[in-house]
């Protein structure tokens, strides 16, 4: 039975040209995390595999930085980056857990950031 839950940064906003940390955290399960995939709608951004390290998709390699932790830092934001992002945790033996983050990239300099998520 899958008992885990994914906590995410939820809905966040950031300024155009700035950067943002996408962060998820899997809790309430003893399952082993083997891999975390980060996706934006229909595109793969990055993969963090416990044994192999990071894979950054070529279309994002200049704007995506691995980490912190299993999170992802998205840089040089554009309005086109607005949308849904998914963290997909591959675990053993539970299977797959998915978290959702909505990012809004604002033109103005008064973008209010949602509460930053901290992994203890």
């Amino acid at each position: 039975m899958m008992t885990g839950t994914i906590e995410t940064t939820g809905n966040i906003s950031a300024e155009k040209g700035g950067s943002i940390i996408l962060q998820c955290h899997l809790s309430s399960t003893t399952a082993q995390v083997t891999q975390v995939n980060w996706e934006q709608q229909d595109q793969l951004l990055a993969i963090c595999n416990a044994d192999l390290g990071w894979h950054i998709s070529p279309s994002f390699k200049d704007r995506v930085a691995p980490g912190p932790g299993l999170g992802l830092t998205l840089q040089s934001l554009t309005v086109n980056d607005t949308g849904e992002y998914f963290c997909i945790y591959h675990t053993y033996p539970d299977g797959t857990y998915t978290g959702r983050i909505f990012l809004e990239v604002l033109e103005s300099s008064v973008a209010e950031h949602g509460a930053r998520f901290q992994i203890p």
Partner: antibody
Framework: QVQLVQSGAEVVKPGASVKVSCKAS????????IEWIYQAPGQGLEWIGV????????IYNQKFQGKATLTADKSSNIAYLELSRLRSDDSAVYFC????????????WGQGTLLTVSS | DIVMTQSPSSLSTSVGDRVTITCRAS??????VVWYQQKPGKSPKLLIY???YRYSGVPSRFSGSGSGTDFTFTISSVQPEDFAVYYC?????????FGGGTKVEIK
């Protein structure tokens, strides 16, 4: 330039073991992943597993678990595929392939090693 | 394990023709798909990755597209040197898997 050079063809008896090598040159060995692929005569490609020479981390296709062991020697820039308890259906060409840094895209390939298991 | 089903398994075509090969994943693989070309007795060669980027030095007649579970590989105008076997490959989740291959033959 980047090169992966594999050891030569092997003929071994059923039940024996064999170690195939993949010598890397032209790059920092620990910045690459090395994967291994099996191709039976006239058949398609089958993924055996992958090793991160920097960390020693490995992932195997369950079908080859217990059959294949992947290792890497950072001092000599060589990755190894050891195959044990050989049977006739292990006769195949074995390829190594390398992928640089933040990529799981394997763009450099060895020339292949033909293994024949026969009594 | 994710099964990559390639079709057709073989096709006969003439120089100058357009060729399309499809690959369907048994579950979501996002854009973590690459295409390889293999000629008899040779190692596979990377052609397309992620799944619409041409690898360095690959001619523009080769292209790829797709996302999720359905992927397409196209040769816009087949040349004599393109007769080979083509494989799709997913690296979305381990174990990584290959399609069964498509043999492109001369008609």
């Amino acid at each position: 330039q980047v090169q992966l050079v594999q050891s030569g063809a092997e003929v071994v008896k059923p039940g024996a073991s064999v170690k195939v090598s993949c010598k890397a040159s032209g790059y920092a060995f620990t910045n690459y992943l090395i994967e291994w692929i099996y191709q039976a005569p006239g058949q398609g490609l089958e993924w055996i597993g992958v090793i991160n020479p920097g960390s020693g981390g490995t992932i195997y296709n369950q079908k080859f678990q217990g059959k294949a062991t992947l290792t890497a020697d950072k001092s000599s820039n060589i990755a190894y595929l050891e195959l044990s308890r050989l049977r006739s259906d292990d006769s195949a060409v074995y390829f190594c392939a390398g992928s640089y840094g933040s990529s799981y895209t394997f763009d450099y390939w060895g020339q292949g090693t033909l293994l024949t298991v026969s009594s | 394990d994710i099964v990559m089903t390639q079709s057709p398994s073989s096709l006969s075509t003439s120089v100058g023709d357009r060729v399309t090969i499809t690959c369907r994943a048994s579950q979501h693989v996002s854009t973590a798909v690459v295409w390889y070309q293999q000629k008899p007795g040779k190692s596979p060669k990377l052609l397309i990755y992620s799944p619409s980027y041409r690898y360095s030095g690959v001619p523009s007649r080769f292209s790829g597209s797709g996302s999720g579970t359905d992927f397409t590989f196209t040769i816009s105008s087949v040349q004599p040197e393109d007769f080979a076997v083509y494989y799709c490959h997913q690296h979305y989740s381990t174990p990584w898997t290959f399609g069964g291959g498509t043999k492109v033959e001369i008609k």
